[in-house]
């Protein structure tokens, strides 16, 4: 089944998708649609590359990472509910039924408004999920210590930070990866 | 591998109370909605109502409104639905779904629980 | 509480025709609408989510189209294990289902 992806209202969010390229440059076409991958295509695509650019791309989402170097991930920006759903990412190798497919689920939770605590020095507590990923393998949580009193606005910027960078490295390991060549 | 175990067939007389279980397996119950929804035969599909295991919310139609009640335990991964006052109209099959996330559509459903009100 | 109706309680069709399904909403509910196929015996599956996304595993030949309060759910080509009951849902509001249409092939 596809794998797993989640973000809260409001927030960015991240599906990883990633091939590498036979050679620096030589760069293989991609479609992100919405709906799992039909046969051929992309159905309701989003965003699309050829061989040397992003030629199309619908607003709110865009790729965030290198996608010459084959980081095809995709950002989906201020997500709402309607986010929610199956997602394509098709890697478009020339070639008759070369087409790697990969269908991820994003699952958009809402914010629930909560009263503030007064202290919050356990972050994983405050947002138990919003930082795990769910890949291949076991879960992989990244944890926030403990750091100084600050209000829920910079929890909420911080986690969303760590989302855009260090998580992205992490996902690279359990996203869709594939080698071309 | 998702899957929503529901349990077994009931009879009871009209106007006594039933509570029906749902044991899910390969997910956990605290990531999602999860729904009850009833069929009568030739009535189609009627939602009963849902619950956030994760705390507690939960959310009746109308019709059922103090008269059913979903609530779940997240520690055996399970979810309930309490009916009460029970008619021969509430005699159907009754099914556990999981939300695909927070959307109100489903997908996954566990077998159906048979419930018969008869005297 | 929103209504959908579907109007035809039977098709009948043949293998390899194409037929389409349609649900109607008593109220704008967008396009958060989702169709459910229920064969004998067996409890519903989810085939389109939001009108028109198909959801995983679900063959190319189900399409499903329309936004406001008019809904159409397509099969391209009809196959003989396509026989079953198809539900229209919303999930605009508290969700609602249409009563059913029995696909039969002839």
């Known amino acids: 089944s596809e794998v797993e992806y989640r973000a809260e209202v409001g927030q960015n969010a991240y599906l990883p998708c990633f091939y590498t390229p036979a050679a620096p440059g030589n760069l293989v076409p991609v479609c992100w649609g919405k709906g799992a991958c039909p046969v051929f295509e992309c159905g309701n695509v989003v965003l699309r590359t050829d061989e040397r650019d992003v030629n199309y791309w619908t607003s709110r989402y865009w790729l965030n990472g290198d996608f010459r170097k084959g980081d095809v991930s995709l950002t989906i920006e201020n997500v709402t509910l309607a986010d929610s759903g199956i997602y394509c990412c098709r890697i478009q190798i020339p070639g008759i039924m070369n087409d790697e497919k990969f269908n991820l689920k994003l699952v958009i939770k809402p914010a629930k408004v909560t009263p503030a605590p007064t202290r919050q020095r356990d972050f994983t507590a405050a947002f138990p999920r919003m930082l795990t990923t769910r890949g291949h393998g076991p879960a992989e949580t990244q944890t926030l210590g403990s750091l100084p009193d600050i209000n829920l606005t910079q929890i909420s910027t911080l986690a969303n930070e760590l989302r855009d960078s260090r998580l992205a490295n992490d996902l690279r390991d359990s996203g869709a990866t594939i080698r071309i060549g | 591998e998702v899957q929503l175990q529901q349990s077994g067939a009931e009879v009871v007389r009209p106007g006594a109370s039933v509570k029906l279980s749902c044991t899910s397996s390969?997910?956990?119950?605290?990531?999602?909605?999860l729904h009850w929804v009833m069929q009568r035969t030739e009535h189609g599909l009627n939602w009963i109502g849902r619950?956030?295991?994760?705390?507690?919310?939960?959310k009746y139609a109308p019709q059922f409104q103090g008269r059913a009640t979903i609530t779940a335990d997240t520690s055996s991964n399970t979810a309930y639905l309490q009916l009460s006052s029970l008619t021969s109209e509430d005699t159907a099959v009754y099914y556990c779904?999981?939300?695909?996330?927070?959307?109100?559509?489903?997908?996954?459903w566990g077998q159906g629980t048979t419930l018969t009100v008869s005297s | 509480d929103i209504v959908m109706t579907q109007s035809h309680k039977f098709m009948s069709t043949s293998v390899r025709d194409r037929v389409s399904i349609t649900c109607k909403a008593s109220?704008?509910?967008?396009?958060?609408v989702a169709w459910y196929q229920q064969k004998p015996g067996q409890s519903p599956k989810l085939l389109i989510y939001?009108?028109?996304y198909r959801y995983t595993g679900v063959p190319d030949r189900f399409t499903g189209s329309g936004s406001g309060t008019d809904f159409t759910f397509t099969i391209s080509s009809v196959q003989a294990e396509d026989l079953a009951v198809y539900y229209c849902?919303?999930?605009?509001?508290?969700?609602?289902f249409g009563g059913g249409t029995k696909l039969e092939i002839q």
């Open positions: 779904t999981r939300d695909f996330g927070y959307t109100d559509y489903f997908d996954y």
């Open positions: 390969g997910f956990n119950i605290k990531d999602y909605y």
């Open positions: 619950i956030d295991p994760d705390d507690a919310e939960t």
């Open positions: 109220q704008d509910v967008s396009t958060a």
């Open positions: 939001s009108a028109s």
């Open positions: 849902q919303q999930h605009y509001s508290t969700p609602t």
